[in-house]
């Protein structure tokens, strides 16, 4: 059996103010079945970042065509950077449990810190 | 080509069991969610079961008596099935199921369907 | 559960006619929504998912719509080999799937 791994490649990711930041994530399995969402920091204070199922994230759009069959690639972009917006990142799986998903497994994370402003 | 075949149909008297199976092929089973879907003689569709690796849901009409399972390796999907009754009688397809966008299942491929028919 | 009510029960329809069948849901299910066709003594065929994408294959004769509660699957110029009947299925909110009663297209 395919063990599902979540793919986060970039460990650092520095952004400038005002710019658009791109969070890659990818996985190795459909399964389990249930959504991946989008988190930053951990824990239970953590602050959802992205639900395509249900929510509104104005700043947030998916890399991949939303009507894709059989996606594998959850990567996100984030627009409009503010240093509000530093902190580690995480994609996660969640396995379809009813009536409440329950994490399955979470990516290793990518950390967002503010770069140089351009010259 | 992706093909879904069914077999393990027949007659069985209330009570009995029953084992149904889905061989599989043309796409990587594994990594894929499969499905159970019945439909009675002249009636509509009715989904069963479905599996994903290790996780297993169920209509509430066969939970309890019906059991999905998988064999990766012989790229197999199975159903058990145990204390029948008449209105289990049905078609029972296979389906390979397929996600959209983050998340959603529907079904994109269908066997042909094996025939159960539960008669004292 | 989500209950999905599929009207006209049947459809007497001529080839080369525009047919539109209609799929209501008792809940918001956003786009979650399939289409598939069924011929007698036939398994069913996927046509069209996420309310309006079609499947690999399927003629642009078929065409989905809505979001929401109220979904329509046409056919802007039924052809004879679209004789057979037509069901909608939920996949927003699940175990379980739901599918809707069908819709019967017979030859007027």
């Known amino acids: 059996e395919e063990e599902l791994q979540m793919i986060q490649p970039e460990k650092l990711l520095l952004v400038t103010v005002g710019k658009t930041a791109t969070l890659h994530c990818t996985v190795t399995s459909l399964l389990p079945v249930g959504p991946v969402l989008w988190f930053r920091g951990v824990g239970p204070g953590r602050e959802l970042i992205y639900n395509q199922k249900e929510g509104h994230f104005p700043r947030v759009t998916t890399v991949s065509d939303l009507t894709k069959r059989n996606n594998m690639d959850f990567s996100i972009r984030i627009s409009s950077i503010t240093p509000a917006d530093v902190g580690t990142y995480y994609c996660v799986k969640f396995r379809k449990g009813s009536p409440e998903n329950v994490e399955f497994k979470s990516g290793p994370g990518t950390e967002m810190a503010l770069g140089a402003k351009p010259s | 080509e992706v093909q879904l075949v069914e077999s393990g149909g027949g007659v069985v008297q209330p009570g009995g069991s029953l084992r149904l199976s889905c061989a599989a092929s043309?796409?990587?089973?594994?990594?894929?969610?499969v499905s159970w879907v019945r439909q009675a003689p002249g009636k509509g569709l009715e989904w069963v079961s479905t599996?994903?690796?290790?996780?297993?849901y169920y209509a509430d009409s066969v939970k309890g008596r019906f059991t999905i399972s998988r064999d990766n390796s012989k790229n197999t999907l199975y159903l058990q099935m145990n204390s029948l009754r008449a209105e289990d009688t049905a078609v029972y397809y296979c389906?390979?199921?397929?996600?959209?966008?983050?998340?959603?299942?529907?079904?994109?491929?269908w066997g042909q369907g094996t025939l159960v028919t539960v008669s004292s | 559960e989500i209950v999905l009510t599929q009207s006209p029960a049947t459809l007497s329809v001529s080839p080369g006619e525009r047919v539109t069948f209609s799929c209501r849901a008792s809940?918001?299910?956003?786009?979650?929504i399939a289409w598939y066709q069924q011929k007698p003594g036939q398994a069913p065929r996927l046509l069209i998912y996420?309310?309006?994408s079609r499947d690999t294959g399927i003629p642009d004769r078929f065409s989905g719509s809505g979001s929401g509660t109220d979904f329509t699957l046409t056919i802007s110029s039924l052809q004879s080999e679209d004789f057979g009947v037509y069901y909608c299925?939920?996949?927003?909110?699940?175990?379980?799937?739901?599918f809707g009663g069908g819709t019967k297209v017979e030859i007027k």
């Open positions: 389906a390979k199921d397929s996600t959209v966008g983050w998340s959603g299942d529907f079904f994109d491929y």
């Open positions: 043309g796409f990587s089973f594994s990594i894929y969610a």
């Open positions: 599996i994903g690796a290790d996780d297993t």
């Open positions: 809940q918001n299910v956003r786009s979650d």
């Open positions: 996420a309310a309006s």
């Open positions: 299925q939920q996949y927003y909110d699940w175990p379980p799937f739901t």
